[in-house]
């Protein structure tokens, strides 16, 4: 029961995850401008990974794409791609948790595989979650570079008359979305991995039955293990477990008239 | 179509408050912001302050203690309050409505306010 | 506040002449967001509220003839009349609407001879 539920919940807790990356790659508001001891403008600029809006206090928003590739700063170009692959593998990584899922049955597939596919999965999704806080942080990393410069010489005088007021830009409402979200995913996949250790048999856990032939018994263990003489401990047709005491989730289970696909 | 309408008293004595309303039609004050802007006597163009769609106001400086902009959406009306009147208040006051740009496409007629004992 | 300075205060012209005014603000009107420049300008006849022309500092507003062109960036501005006609004399204001407060420069009247 514990594991199916620690597996439920990795599933849940990484599509969540997931979807908040999917948010944060698509939203505007990677950096927003800094209002803090600026002057008060009619117009309030933001950017996100591929497009820079403008809301002017008319109300009205117009926004442009950056329709370039090479003119980009790489940093951004590297964002993009962190983000990118981390959906990419997040989104593999669901399809091939879904078909994991304890609770869910396909044909005959068998303990094993599920663990090795919940084991994946994981991986995928702590991959995925790191390269969205990778992402976000080196963007982060940008700003609080490119603020601290353009505060250096925020205003540029010329000739000592007119000022230019640069636009100094601060962490946006996406970078907050990313980081939360590549944290769940990452904390989705670790509880997949934990559930995977469950989820694979150190040994199978057939019930060992006892063949009482003339003259000893031999308790016989069916699989290709070892057998076991009976002499001494196990006379007496008791059950033999592959050792320590283990969970409902962990006894393999058989289909039954209850079982639902 | 578009149209912004000032009414105010017309008169006011000095050190008195001033009230003007501004009913507009052909657009809706929770998308469009509103602007108070005066001109005295062959004078110039003063800007007053503004009141956004969201509600939100910015005021003149030189004004912000005796000024204060409100609206009815309901009622599609924006009204200017200013307190202590001088007669250098003595001017034409409009309201416009503010549009792409930050700028003012559509202007009232102005109504006249004289200060005078 | 932005100072906004128009120059010169008055113009006499003939029919069918060229017309240049020019408005500067103490600050850049520029948006770097946008690369524009939020200044407009608007014209104003005798016992009439003054009239939008151009916005964002080159963009003409609908219904204002392909004579008047705004032009500028930043601090200094330009408005052109390219062929006066009698409608056109009037007082003409700039207007910074990237600062608040709003301001407005102290006009250019445009006369005839």
């Known amino acids: 029961m514990a594991v199916t539920a620690c597996q439920g919940l990795g599933f849940v807790v990484s599509l969540i995850g997931i979807a908040g990356i999917i948010a944060a790659t698509c939203m505007d508001q990677w950096s927003t401008q800094d209002l803090y001891n600026n002057p008060v403008t009619a117009v309030f600029n933001y950017q996100g990974l591929w497009r820079s809006c403008v809301r002017e206090s008319s109300g009205f928003t117009e926004c442009r794409g950056y329709f370039t590739l090479l003119g980009l700063p790489a940093m951004l170009q590297a964002v993009r791609a962190l983000m990118i692959v981390g959906i990419v593998l997040g989104a593999i990584g669901l399809l091939v948790s879904i078909f994991a899922l304890k609770c869910i049955r396909i044909g005959s597939m068998e303990d094993s595989a599920k663990a090795n596919m919940t084991l994946t999965s994981g991986i995928m999704f702590i991959v995925s979650g790191l390269c969205a806080i990778a992402g976000v942080s080196v963007f982060a990393n940008m700003l609080v570079t490119n603020f601290w410069m353009s505060t250096a010489n925020m205003y540029t005088g010329m000739g000592g008359m007119v000022q230019t007021v640069q636009t100094r830009y601060t962490f946006g409402a996406a970078l907050f979305v990313g980081w939360v979200a590549g944290g769940l995913t990452l904390i989705g996949g670790v509880m997949m991995c934990i559930a995977c250790r469950g989820l694979a048999p150190e040994e199978t856990n057939y019930k060992a039955v006892s063949y009482h032939a003339s003259g000893h018994s031999v308790a016989y263990k069916p699989g290709g293990f070892k057998a076991s003489t009976g002499f001494g401990s196990n006379t007496k047709n008791k059950k033999i477990y592959d050792g320590g005491a283990r969970t409902e989730d962990e006894v393999q289970s058989y289909p039954s008239k209850h079982d639902y696909v | 179509q578009v149209q912004l309408k000032e009414s105010g008293p017309g008169l006011v004595a000095p050190s008195q408050s001033l009230s003007i309303t501004c009913t507009v039609s052909g657009f809706s004050l929770t998308s469009y912001g509103v602007s108070w802007v005066r001109q005295p006597p062959g004078k110039g163009l003063e800007c007053l302050g503004v009141?956004?769609?969201?509600?939100?106001?910015n005021y003149n400086s030189a004004l912000m203690s005796r000024l204060s902009i409100s609206k009815d959406k309901s009622k599609s009306q924006v009204f200017l309050k200013m307190n202590s009147l001088q007669t250098d208040d003595t001017a034409m006051y409009y309201c416009?409505?503010?549009?792409?740009?930050?700028?003012?496409?559509?202007w009232g007629q102005g109504t006249s306010v004289t200060v005078s004992s | 506040d932005i100072v906004m300075t128009q120059s010169p205060s008055s113009l006499t012209v003939t029919a069918g002449e060229k017309v240049t005014m020019s408005c500067k603000s103490s600050q850049s009107l520029l948006n770097s967001g946008n690369q524009k420049s939020y200044l407009t300008w608007y014209q104003q006849r005798p016992g009439q509220p003054p009239k939008l022309l151009i916005y964002w500092a080159s963009t003409r507003e609908s219904g204002v003839p392909d004579r008047f062109t705004g032009s500028g960036s930043g601090t200094d501005f330009t408005l052109t009349i390219s062929s006066v006609q009698a409608e056109d004399l009037a007082v003409y204001f700039c207007?910074?609407?990237?600062?608040?407060?709003?301001?407005f420069g102290s006009g250019t009247k445009l006369e005839t001879k």
């Open positions: 416009a409505r503010v549009y792409y740009g930050n700028a003012m496409d559509y």
């Open positions: 207007q910074n609407v990237y600062f608040f407060p709003f301001t």
């Open positions: 009141i956004w769609a969201g509600g939100n106001t």
